[in-house]
Amino acid sequence: MAPWPELGDAQPNPDKYLEGAAGQQPTAPDKSKETNKTDNTEAPVTKIELLPSYSTATLIDEPTEVDDPWNLPTLQDSGIKWSERDTKGKILCFFQGIGRLILLLGFLYFFVCSLDILSSAFQLVGGKMAGQFFSNSSIMSNPLLGLVIGVLVTVLVQSSSTSTSIVVSMVSSSLLTVRAAIPIIMGANIGTSITNTIVALMQVGDRSEFRRAFAGATVHDFFNWLSVLVLLPVEVATHYLEIITQLIVESFHFKNGEDAPDLLKVITKPFTKLIVQLDKKVISQIAMNDEKAKNKSLVKIWCKTFTNKTQINVTVPSTANCTSPSLCWTDGIQNWTMKNVTYKENIAKCQHIFVNFHLPDLAVGTILLILSLLVLCGCLIMIVKILGSVLKGQVATVIKKTINTDFPFPFAWLTGYLAILVGAGMTFIVQSSSVFTSALTPLIGIGVITIERAYPLTLGSNIGTTTTAILAALASPGNALRSSLQIALCHFFFNISGILLWYPIPFTRLPIRMAKGLGNISAKYRWFAVFYLIIFFFLIPLTVFGLSLAGWRVLVGVGVPVVFIIILVLCLRLLQSRCPRVLPKKLQNWNFLPLWMRSLKPWDAVVSKFTGCFQMRCCCCCRVCCRACCLLCDCPKCCRCSKCCEDLEEAQEGQDVPVKAPETFDNITISREAQGEVPASDSKTECTAL
């Protein structure tokens, strides 16, 4: 792939977008104080004005934009002011507000439920395969294999808690050492960040919104990848996580605690268990090489069972196989012994949709995967719509100020750390980092939360999920307590180490810059978002997995040249932007490479051809399909429901520019009308102030 997606002849033009430069956008004059960010991540050196004419930080020829695309949109209130309303209007407005709140909570509820069902669907589709990944004996000796197994398994089961609980059970039954488990935990941390990235894809309809949402989601990915990139070699060399956690576990005499409180599950379980119920023990059993488990279904059929322990007579090949000498006898031909057996009697069937269908796991999983994604997408669209109509004018100003404004000097630096605590606390309450970060994504998209603020919230979420794991570990039975606690602590200290690496010093907040860069690319070439998802969460881990299975010689033989090329490109890129004069003329830009190696334009043409849209028509039957279609064919504008958009962007033909961002419109609703997304509504009836 290209070192940077677009590397043409560079012209220092501060009014143009930088397509790939990790979020280094020209700074626009501040329109409103509320978008001011104190914890600015950008280093002064990288400002566009300072780039020499021969720099390779290419600027795309686009119409001049006054605004920084990363500035939050101004959500203006076009409705009648509260003071100007009559009593009837006020009452109507009040009930409208209550109605919206109820709708918002309802959609939020189904959004969280669909995430839960999405996880179940993934487990049904890939859970058994995930379990088999764990039964690979090379994990013990190859930390890289452990890492990718952690990623793949968590992506396949859509739940880091499932993959970590498998690891815990494997460690406590001595199938895995804590040392071998640490890379898997790191991988699980990466894998869990796919959920909010998938959620971000649902906001593909609006380029500006998508840019922010996708960047906000991938900041989690980049944090995890970068942390692993640095901390895995450190761990392999020093075993610091293993040593620290071992010391902690050994220095405390832990008593078995109580289970971590299931706060959100209490509300969502009654609904999700009506859809499907899974027997998660099956995945663990497969991971622990239980042959019988391979033929078991993950779909739970019996919910009420009676377990009776009894002793039965069984034949054994010889007296040596007897349970004990005193429990050994013969009938003259065969040797017999007495075995304790647990007899399971099925009493009552589970009450869920798939209980009587007897469909294969793959079929149930596929059905649920499609349905949950549709519900997820639908809920997300509705949440964004409701929030868009509620968060306007004063309400928006108050919320944005509260969330995005820093503490007064000299305590500004504390704001981010408070956000980390809030993220951790919220994740602890909802018991899932995926749920928290997925709920955060649309808020970043519509511009309520800045990426700079979302970043510490996400980091906090990473911490929150580990505190849940620590509590769950303390509730483990005696034999699993030590191992589960040590693994939970490894997870905790890994995230703490990551935060220390990529948060305290603004300059080191690389994940923000990288996420912004990816947001820019994905807003321009929306198919790249899917491409990124497949590459980072499937292809790279699967390639490493395959190479690891082929042996370490093959892994090193392929890996070393690849790593060398990446380092070479990064060094060259750094020299091009910082001190190009030291480079030969030819290497001062990327023009020496063929276009397909330095730009996404040719790839865009290929993708467009493959999807059959040719960027001219984008047919759809419903809003959800429309969004999916827009994502695949990169249709410039999202079509109206039940209609086709045929070359809606004639005015912009030949120009690779983002659709006019909603911030230039009075409010989101109006902006969407202009983009042909929603039917026009009488703005006078809008009620925003509660």
């Epitope: 005193s326 013969t330 009938d331 031909i333």
Partner: antibody, heavy 120, light 107 residues
């Protein structure tokens, strides 16, 4: 009721073989193990071996291995024991017996016995 | 092979007396022990299996006990029809082995 009827007494010369039968009735022949036990005059009981008629599986006392052959004919519900290379110490009453107490070697039904006299 | 040592080899007692016959196994046989009664000129008859379980039709004056290596058969109140030779048997290991027998007579 369960009945085990054994063949009549035999007088054989040393070195010869003897084959005795045990005809059963009153139960399903293939269900239970058939044991063969002998008792020398004025002596204790000695287990020779057993056969499971259902599969033909056999088990022998190491002392008799190579000299004894146990067989079963399912069609006639009859068990057979053949003892070769007879010696004078093989003179005894030979009993066939079954164990209806599943999985145990405790035999609860016995035949009347076949007296084998080894004499030159 | 497991050797079953039975004692006494014979005993003479009166009707109504309590009779105790012991059997010692050369190694642990758990509870896989049976007791047989053989009257002169007859085939043996199963009295007790699994050390203490009476076979159907066996009077309750016959009681078995023990485990491991030491086993006992008790005839609580000797009756004239109990005159016979009593054998213990282990079925813990192949080959099945019997005790040498205890001859019970009435004075």
């Amino acid at each position: 009721q369960v009945q085990l009827v054994q063949s009549g007494a035999e007088v054989v010369k040393p070195g010869a073989s003897v084959k005795m039968s045990c005809k059963t009735s009153g139960y399903t022949f293939i269900t239970y193990n058939m044991h063969w036990v002998r008792q020398a005059p004025g002596q204790g009981l000695e287990w020779i071996g057993a056969i499971y008629p259902g599969s033909g599986d056999t088990s022998y006392n190491q002392k008799f291995k190579g000299r004894v052959t146990l067989t079963a004919d399912k069609s006639t519900s009859t068990a057979y024991m053949e003892l070769s290379s007879l010696r004078s110490e093989d003179t005894a009453v030979y009993y066939c017996s079954i164990s209806t107490i599943i999985t145990t070697g405790a035999v609860d039904y016995w035949g009347q016995g076949t007296l084998v006299t080894v004499s030159s | 092979d497991i050797v079953m040592t039975q004692s006494p080899s014979s005993l003479s007692t009166s009707v109504g007396d309590r009779v105790t016959i012991t059997c010692k196994a050369s190694q642990d046989v758990g509870t896989a022990v049976a007791w047989y009664q053989q009257k002169p000129g007859q085939s043996p008859k199963l009295l007790i299996y699994w050390t203490s379980t009476r076979h159907t039709g066996v009077p309750d004056r016959f009681t078995g006990s023990g485990s491991g290596t030491d086993f006992t058969l008790i005839i609580r109140s000797l009756q004239p029809e109990d005159v016979a030779t009593y054998f213990c048997q282990q079925y813990s290991r192949i080959p099945l082995t019997f005790g040498s027998g205890t001859k019970v007579e009435i004075k």
